[in-house]
Interface confidence: medium
């Protein structure tokens, strides 16, 4: 099943201590899906979309220096025929960068 779209949403982080907000959206015919957010190949967070919505926003607290670095991906799963779980492909990657301090 098709990959979701992924994007950063405001407010954008200005430092590593700021929270990160990442929206993940399935195509229109997959509302209520279960979403997984990965970073650096590891699962960061799991969220289920409301039954009338096709996306979620992951809110990651700042300062989690132990989290793996690298790009984020997301993926969703839906129940198909015979209640079999079907997984989408992974989204394209999205990176988080912080403005260079001016001081």
């Amino acid at each position: 099943i098709p990959a979701p779209s992924i994007r950063l949403v405001p407010p954008y982080p200005s430092s590593q201590e700021d929270p990160i907000h990442i929206a993940c959206m399935a195509p229109g015919n997959f509302p209520g899906a279960n979403f997984t957010l990965y970073r650096g190949g590891q699962v960061v967070q799991l969220l289920q979309a409301p039954t009338d919505q096709r996306g979620v926003t992951f809110n990651l607290s700042g300062g989690s220096s132990k989290a793996p670095g690298g790009p984020f991906h997301c993926q969703y799963g839906v129940l198909g025929e015979l209640n079999q779980s079907q997984l989408s492909d992974l989204s394209e990657p999205v990176n988080v960068s912080f403005p260079v301090p001016t001081w």
């Epitope: 190949g41 799991l46 690298g70 790009p71 991906h73 993926q75 779980s85 997984l87 990176n95």
Partner: antibody
């Protein structure tokens, strides 16, 4: 198109150092991890580790801790493998490999390292 | 460390017949509904080429004659029908945990 171009073959003596380069093009370098794979003559593939091209953090397999170092020159979209204090058992072809969706999708052409006194 | 055992080590298959290669992992390579098992083809003097990623997904540009299946610890690469150009060594690889590991390889000969 996506390409990983590695530096040419190396002939070294035991105890010397070699540094292999891997220049990436055709994609955003920092979006994908870079892995290194060793293949001794006539043998199978052995994963050496990978470097997170976004943070620069390397991860080494146990057999490649100590004498081996991964590094980056991010503005030049280039990854490096350095092997110090070369030994006979380091004689092999080394591949840099892009990681995509956790599989190894684009491979460099390989760099042959010969160790001979 | 996850050990991958491929079988057979070599096989000879007639043109247009089916080739089946097995890869068994010493522990599960599944996480969160994904099977982190991949298959590669390597011809002499060339780098390996990705064929199948995450157990059953066909890499772009790879002929549909190649397919992958399996989950947890048991995986299969199938080539049907085999063509002369398929003579090569095939490797499975897991990326569920570090160290990433490869199977020992299966050499396919076309009769």
């Amino acid at each position: 198109q996506i390409q990983l171009v590695q530096s040419g073959p190396e002939l070294k003596k035991p105890g010397e150092t070699v540094k292999i380069s891997c220049k990436a093009s055709g994609y955003t370098f920092t979006n994908y991890g870079m892995n290194w794979v060793k293949q001794a003559p006539g043998k199978g593939l052995k994963w050496m580790g990978w470097i997170n091209t976004y943070t620069g953090e390397p991860t080494y397999a146990d057999d490649f801790k100590g004498r081996f170092a991964f590094s980056l020159e991010t503005p030049a979209s280039t990854a490096y493998l350095q092997i110090n204090n070369l030994k006979n058992e380091d004689m092999a072809t080394y591949f840099c490999v892009r990681e995509h969706f956790y599989a190894l999708d684009y491979w460099g052409q390989g760099t042959s390292v010969t160790v001979s006194s | 460390k996850i050990v991958l055992t491929q079988s057979p080590a070599s096989l000879a298959v007639s043109l247009r017949q089916r080739a089946t290669i097995s890869c068994r992992a010493s522990e599960s390579v599944d996480s969160y509904g994904n099977s982190f098992m991949h298959w590669y083809q390597q011809k002499p003097g060339q780098p390996p080429k990705l064929l199948i990623y995450r157990a059953s997904n066909l890499e772009s540009g790879v002929p549909a004659r190649f397919s992958g299946s399996g989950s947890r610890t048991d995986f299969t690469l199938t080539i049907d029908p085999v063509e002369a150009d398929d003579a090569a060594t095939y490797y499975c690889q897991q990326s569920n945990e570090d160290p990433r590991t490869f199977g020992g390889g299966t050499k396919l000969e076309i009769k």
